[in-house]
């Protein structure tokens, strides 16, 4: 089920009408941090770095693009789901 959601997100992110899903203007790729100890599982950047990126939406980090995207709550749109539908 989660895989389906991820695929759907990626399809929308890569689609020709990306207004609802957005990436930040400044993509901070910088240096890659080394994987932590243990299993080497990376933390979801949405939980920390981009915690407040989406205003009225949910942050989803698209690994392929190395950037966050927003899925907007009803009635909101724009780069960070900040605009209210008229």
């Amino acid at each position: 089920d989660l895989q389906e959601a991820d695929l759907d997100l990626l399809r929308v992110t890569l689609s020709s009408k990306p207004q609802a899903l957005a990436t930040p203007n400044k993509e901070e790729h910088g240096k890659r941090k080394k994987k932590g100890k243990g299993l080497g599982k990376k933390r979801d950047p949405c939980l920390r770095k981009y915690k407040d990126f989406c205003i009225h939406g949910e942050c989803k980090y698209v690994k392929e693009l190395r950037a966050p995207s927003c899925i907007c709550h009803p009635g909101y749109h724009g780069e960070r789901c900040h605009g209210l539908s008229l």
Partner: antibody
Framework: QVQLVQSGAEVKKPGASVKVSCKAS????????ITWVRQAPGQGLEWMGE????????YYNEKFKGRVTITADKSTSTAYMELSSLRSEDTAVYYC???????????????WGQGTLVTVSS | DIVMTQSPDSLAVSLGERATINCKSS????????????LAWYQQKPGQPPKLLIY???TRESGVPDRFSGSGSGTDFTLTISSLQAEDVAVYYC?????????FGQGTKLEIK
């Protein structure tokens, strides 16, 4: 498989409060919203409000604002709906539902709990 | 608030015949960003929770028989059951998710003639 399991039926007196729980399983709790809809006997569906456990954002129907509080516990994948100052007109089946998304937007409800009957009677 | 009005309130159709339910919104449900209409259809049988049939006005939910179809745009929408089956007897609701508060139509009761 996706499941939403709600708490059992409640009988309350006018003026009291009720708290209904909705335990989610079979999916990542923080990826979707949880909405609450009620249905009075023989009547239609009425949206009460919703929460997005990932961000913590909540939205309420103004009709219930001040009386309804929706919360979520990420550690147990459980959402709660508390309705206060109950009156007889609040007698209804209360449903939780998973709010899904596609094409960049949330808004429709693809899985529903079994419903919780709340009876308000003196 | 966006008001959703369904018609008719009740409908009786013979088995195998086409059933059509209409839903009208008080304002357009067309999202300019994706050019899709934020409308869903649900089926509710007695004693059961509602079941999602259609979203984005015309996208059939996984597992829903293809006799169910949705159409329309802007403010006028239609749910069509191409060939009524006995198990389709239920109440049908439309719902808008264009903006808060989310609202439902009053429901249409579908029976067998």
């Amino acid at each position: 498989q996706v499941q939403l399991v709600q708490s059992g039926a409640e009988v309350k007196k006018p003026g009291a409060s009720v708290k209904v729980s909705c335990k989610a399983s079979g999916y990542t709790f923080t990826t979707y919203g949880i909405t609450w809809v009620r249905q009075a006997p023989g009547q239609g569906l009425e949206w009460m409000g919703e929460i997005f456990p990932g961000s913590g954002n909540t939205y309420y129907n103004e009709k219930f604002k001040g009386r309804v509080t929706i919360t979520a516990d990420k550690s147990t994948s459980t959402a709660y709906m508390e309705l206060s100052s109950l009156r007889s007109e609040d007698t209804a089946v209360y449903y939780c539902a998973r709010e899904s998304f596609s094409d960049g937007y949330y808004g429709y409800f693809d899985y529903w709990g079994q419903g919780t009957l709340v009876t308000v009677s003196s | 608030d966006i008001v959703m009005t369904q018609s008719p309130d009740s409908l009786a159709v013979s088995l195998g015949e086409r059933a059509t339910i209409n839903c009208k919104s008080s304002q357009s449900l067309l999202y300019s960003t994706n050019q899709k209409n934020s409308l869903a259809w649900y089926q509710q049988k007695p004693g059961q929770p509602p079941k999602l049939l259609i979203y984005w006005a015309s996208t059939r939910e996984s597992g829903v028989p293809d006799r169910f179809s949705g159409s329309g745009s802007g403010t006028d929408f239609t749910l069509t059951i191409s060939s009524l089956q006995a198990e389709d007897v239920a109440v049908y609701y439309c719902q808008q998710y264009y903006r808060y508060p989310l609202t439902f139509g009053q429901g249409t009761k579908l029976e067998i003639k």
